[in-house]
């Protein structure tokens, strides 16, 4: 806190300008209005005032604005910004997406700090829903910004915002939010053609049912062995070996490497060793010939 | 990304030094630099300034007339020449850059010790 002093003779601040980084912190706080402040905001990004300087220029604003700055401010704060606290950022009013990319700028390149996560929270909870203008803006920002979110948080994206969302985007989301995705995907997509629409999907696929991968299987995709292994286990187990055989097409080899891990080798375990070694692909682990197979499930089911 | 000061060191009042800011990294072309000293105990304060485009300087009071501070873009490098010092010149002296509207990028630099004692 710096102790309120008369502004000696002639350092009355007329504009925000270079000559204020000779101001001692005391000076700044007697010297310089805030309101002026406030209208010239623009101009301290320019100045390379210290951080010690940089605290009362804050001090300052939030003197002249308790109830949280407006938006004209805001946009200006440029690296004003990194002082800012969760709590300062939870009395904001931000709109504009202009002014959601400038605050980001200004964090550009570093890890997604609290307050960037509370300015977000904020954002989007004043427009309601995550539209494609703002999802482009905060995926390109931070690519991993999706899977940041919980399912119940991703419920509120709306089918056309998918068409923002780049493979890259989803890279750290797990099973539980693309089962939340897929769906929208599916939906966002559904007008393309065969190729064009599995090029589309198939980054959101972790999140696919079992009847979607078969009816995959019909169209001569060639999914890629690192697609497949991110499908649910649940979903590939009901899947045949001429389906499988069908889904990955010329990459059907690469399951040996993979016999082993997940959703391969439940996959194995539930497929006749028959039906595996037609692959062959050297497969082991299959039901031997001449076993029952009894799905206990569809018994429990019945009784 | 970073700000790298030299040129400090040890010399007697009345005497030079040449301080130099150095940007690795980046381009310092588009960033007004501020140079910045500390005294043991004191607080920061700036000592000069020189815009993005080198056309205007300027000058805390207490070193107007002593102080020049210049830059040369195609050496990333913008320079502080320091005559007739004085013992109340002794401190860290840091550079910082800062990047002006549509670019908050700014940074700061370690610092260089001048210590001006008879």
């Known amino acids: 806190e710096v102790e309120k002093t008369a502004c000696p003779s002639g350092k009355k601040a007329r504009e925000i300008d270079e000559s204020l980084i000779f101001y001692k912190k005391w000076e700044l706080e007697a010297c310089v209005d805030a309101a002026l402040l406030a209208t010239q905001m623009d101009r301290v990004n320019a100045i390379p005032f210290t951080y010690e300087q940089l605290d009362v220029l804050k001090h300052k604003l939030d003197e002249l604005y308790p109830q949280g700055y407006p938006e004209s401010v805001i946009q200006h704060l440029g690296y004003l910004f990194l002082k800012m606290s969760p709590e300062d950022i939870r009395k904001w009013n931000v709109t504009s997406l202009e002014t959601l990319k400038a605050l980001l700028e200004v964090n550009k390149g570093h890890e997604m700090s609290p307050q960037v996560a509370t300015l977000i929270d904020r954002f989007v909870k004043g427009r309601g829903q995550l539209d494609k203008d703002t999802l482009d803006t905060l995926t390109a920002f931070y690519p991993g910004y999706l899977c940041s979110l919980s399912p119940e948080e991703l419920s509120s994206v709306p089918p056309s915002s998918i068409w923002a969302v780049r493979p890259q985007d989803l890279d750290t989301c797990d099973p539980r939010q693309l089962d939340v995705l897929y769906p929208k995907a599916r939906l966002a997509f559904q007008n393309m053609n065969g190729s064009e629409y599995f090029v589309k999907i198939q980054s959101f696929l972790g999140g696919a049912p079992t009847e979607d991968l078969k009816a995959l299987s019909q169209q001569n995709v060639s999914m890629d062995l690192a697609t497949f292994m991110k499908l649910r286990t649940d979903a590939v187990l009901p899947l045949t070996v001429a389906e499988v055989q069908k889904l990955l097409g010329p990459h059907v080899e690469g399951l040996k490497a993979e016999e082993r891990h997940r959703p391969v080798r439940d996959w194995i375990l539930r497929q006749r060793q028959d039906d595996l070694d037609t692959l062959g692909l050297g497969l082991q682990g299959g039901i031997p010939n001449g076993y029952l197979v009894l799905d206990l499930s569809m018994q429990e089911a019945l009784s | 990304l970073q700000l790298v000061e030299s040129g400090g060191g040890l010399d007697q009042p009345g005497g030079s030094l040449r301080l130099s800011c150095a940007a690795s990294?980046?381009?310092?072309?588009?960033?007004?630099i501020g140079w910045f000293r500390q005294a043991p105990g004191k607080e920061r304060e700036g000592v000069s300034y020189?815009?993005?485009?080198?056309?205007?300087?300027n000058y805390a009071d207490s070193v107007k007339g002593r102080f020049t501070i210049s830059r040369d873009n195609a050496k990333n490098t913008v320079y502080l020449q320091m005559n007739s010092l004085k013992p109340e010149d002794t401190g860290v002296y840091s550079c910082?850059?800062?990047?002006?509207?549509?670019?908050?990028?700014?940074?700061w630099g370690q610092g260089t010790s001048v210590t001006v004692s008879s």
């Open positions: 020189i815009s993005s485009s080198g056309g205007s300087t």
């Open positions: 990294g980046f381009t310092l072309d588009y960033y007004a």
């Open positions: 910082a850059a800062a990047g002006g509207y549509g670019n908050s990028s700014r940074y």
